[in-house]
Amino acid sequence: KSSNEATNITPKHNMKAFLDELKAENIKKFLYNFTQIPHLAGTEQNFQLAKQIQSQWKEFGLDSVELAHYDVLLSYPNKTHPNYISIINEDGNEIFNTSLFEPPPPGYENVSDIVPPFSAFSPQGMPEGDLVYVNYARTEDFFKLERDMKINCSGKIVIARYGKVFRGNKVKNAQLAGAKGVILYSDPADYFAPGVKSYPDGWNLPGGGVQRGNILNLNGAGDPLTPGYPANEYAYRRGIAEAVGLPSIPVHPIGYYDAQKLLEKMGGSAPPDSSWRGSLKVPYNVGPGFTGNFSTQKVKMHIHSTNEVTRIYNVIGTLRGAVEPDRYVILGGHRDSWVFGGIDPQSGAAVVHEIVRSFGTLKKEGWRPRRTILFASWDAEEFGLLGSTEWAEENSRLLQERGVAYINADSSIEGNYTLRVDCTPLMYSLVHNLTKELKSPDEGFEGKSLYESWTKKSPSPEFSGMPRISKLGSGNDFEVFFQRLGIASGRARYTKNWETNKFSGYPLYHSVYETYELVEKFYDPMFKYHLTVAQVRGGMVFELANSIVLPFDCRDYAVVLRKYADKIYSISMKHPQEMKTYSVSFDSLFSAVKNFTEIASKFSERLQDFDKSNPIVLRMMNDQLMFLERAFIDPLGLPDRPFYRHVIYAPSSHNKYAGESFPGIYDALFDIESKVDPSKAWGEVKRQIYVAAFTVQAAAETLSEVA
């Protein structure tokens, strides 16, 4: 069967029919429905929402919709023993306490089960000691403190501002520096955009607002007690002491009103430079400890949260493919939220809901996609990508053989300025071609394409006339599919103007103020940006599931491989003497990249010319495209990170949110000048070059003619 026989709608009309069926008003309605009460992972409310989504997806017309449950480690505050931080005097009396909860937003005062701000998976403890301010708690911040300023964090409680990097990396860095507790806070410099009012009068963070979030360092493991395997009914669970990624010191988040009280008394060293100063009216002294008059006062943390094995529920919907039912295109986003989830995740879940409804409408009219589409509503993303990872672990054999692509669908918006896309290079051309066919929602771009407004507002740093597309990092549910399984992945959302807004994420991220009203009043009153994101995500899924030849261009991988090889070579060349001494050569890598480029070019030529009416040859060529991403997987994984197996991309070891290219080589080179055994260190660099070169060459050969 050709894919045309799978439908009674003409092929050109297919995509248009799908896109035309998507309605902004429906997305708005779904968002409202999903945000009226909290949907914290592991709670009854989130289970009920899972069942509601299951029921509605069935009504929309999917072939089957099932719940997939797992019993995973989650973390909750103690309801009767709240977490807080105190300033104590020399007698041990608490003279100041941080707030126990955020002031609820207007209209939500009587909502029950709003979880107070906490750092998920913090151990219990009541450490007390002097405070040290560590800026963003990045690797370079601790280098500055320890190496340049000679400040020792051992036995201290550190206070770090949120932003720049994933909070779990901050905690890991603090632990390695010997800290005995971590206080995380939102500084107005990062979470209060100038000229905008704080919620409920605008989209800025009020002083009592606090960012929740997990502080794990899972490195792709999923449930901390069952790494590598699903947390099912017969799972063998590790003891808590052997659990993956748990922090070893107490951690707690606060807002900037409370942070002001802690930071205004700081003494010790002055901040090293202006990059360590935020926007509070405090000196931003580093410490340790409080200034003269207050030097006998200490900070004490009171953390009583508990880790509990709890049941979570994914919703998995299937729309069976008419021609290649054993090829899966997956659209997934999470359902669990910290509180109301006005942006994260429900702005994404509402878009997924409308995409399912549109696909269902076409199916009811007799249409089917060529390939199977799987839709997923993931649970416990906020607790470490647990729902998606457990499901992928359970279904890994199917996914590695049948997985064509994964499109992520968390928050649809983090601003309303322009499009933001992170994806595998295989999807660059798909994204370019699709956005050229979509209308821009932006003011001043009426009648212009999305591609045009996106390119104008977010130009590629390398190629003129093209938009910026970023590397995939982590911190979301695509991680297991891309970094562990090597399934081509992508994500798209509307974002802010990074040029003028230097704050991290959006100000109300993971706070109680992330409500429906935040979106409806301040971000997207017409839901036109949500609709555009639905068109991009849905359009990508449609093309991936329905095009006869998979819309992947392997030549774009060749281009970035050369760019990444150049970049890592230039990093290494900062040490020319050592490269000479230890005979470090990148020739094998550049040779492999050259071979990849030539083979990809020839493959693309064959792709233009082959007989698409021959189903065997078509399937063969498509399989070569599908398995190309898989070919970049090293079964042994990266050093000390066995679940990060992609040799070209991994989450940065210093910031989970960011993607790093040739991560094995990059990590081997990082801070190499400080290594105690240079010979061993440069030996590891050489080994990583070897692994990378071999992998690129092996991947290239999967594109060669099969015989």
Partner: nanobody, 123 residues
Framework: QVQLVESGGGVVQPGRSLRLSCVAS????????MHWVRQAPGKGREWVAV????????YYADSVKGRFTISRDNSKNTLYLQMNSLRPEDTAVYYC????????????????WGQGTTVTVSS
Amino acid sequence: QVQLVESGGGVVQPGRSLRLSCVASGFPFISYGMHWVRQAPGKGREWVAVISYDGSNRYYADSVKGRFTISRDNSKNTLYLQMNSLRPEDTAVYYCAKERIFGVLTPDDFDIWGQGTTVTVSS
């Protein structure tokens, strides 16, 4: 409409106790710091105590420290002032007052006042 209604005042002998209440309506009580302020006959207003919106912090004027306790029940939209070891100089009209900005504590930034309740300490 927005209002604060105090009650619990009365005449009491020195050394005895009294508990004042203030019921709030028309605004989200749970989101605002609350104060007690008093005005003795023929004198200006004197700040007595403040409690944060969530009850995590309470501060007192030196003149009442150790004798008065401010508390709140957010589920009942009610503010309390427990006054022990009363003295003649505690005689005053006691007002509750609401912070103007939600989630913050200030010494004197109030936007709503009650009508007051009179406390007389006399033997």
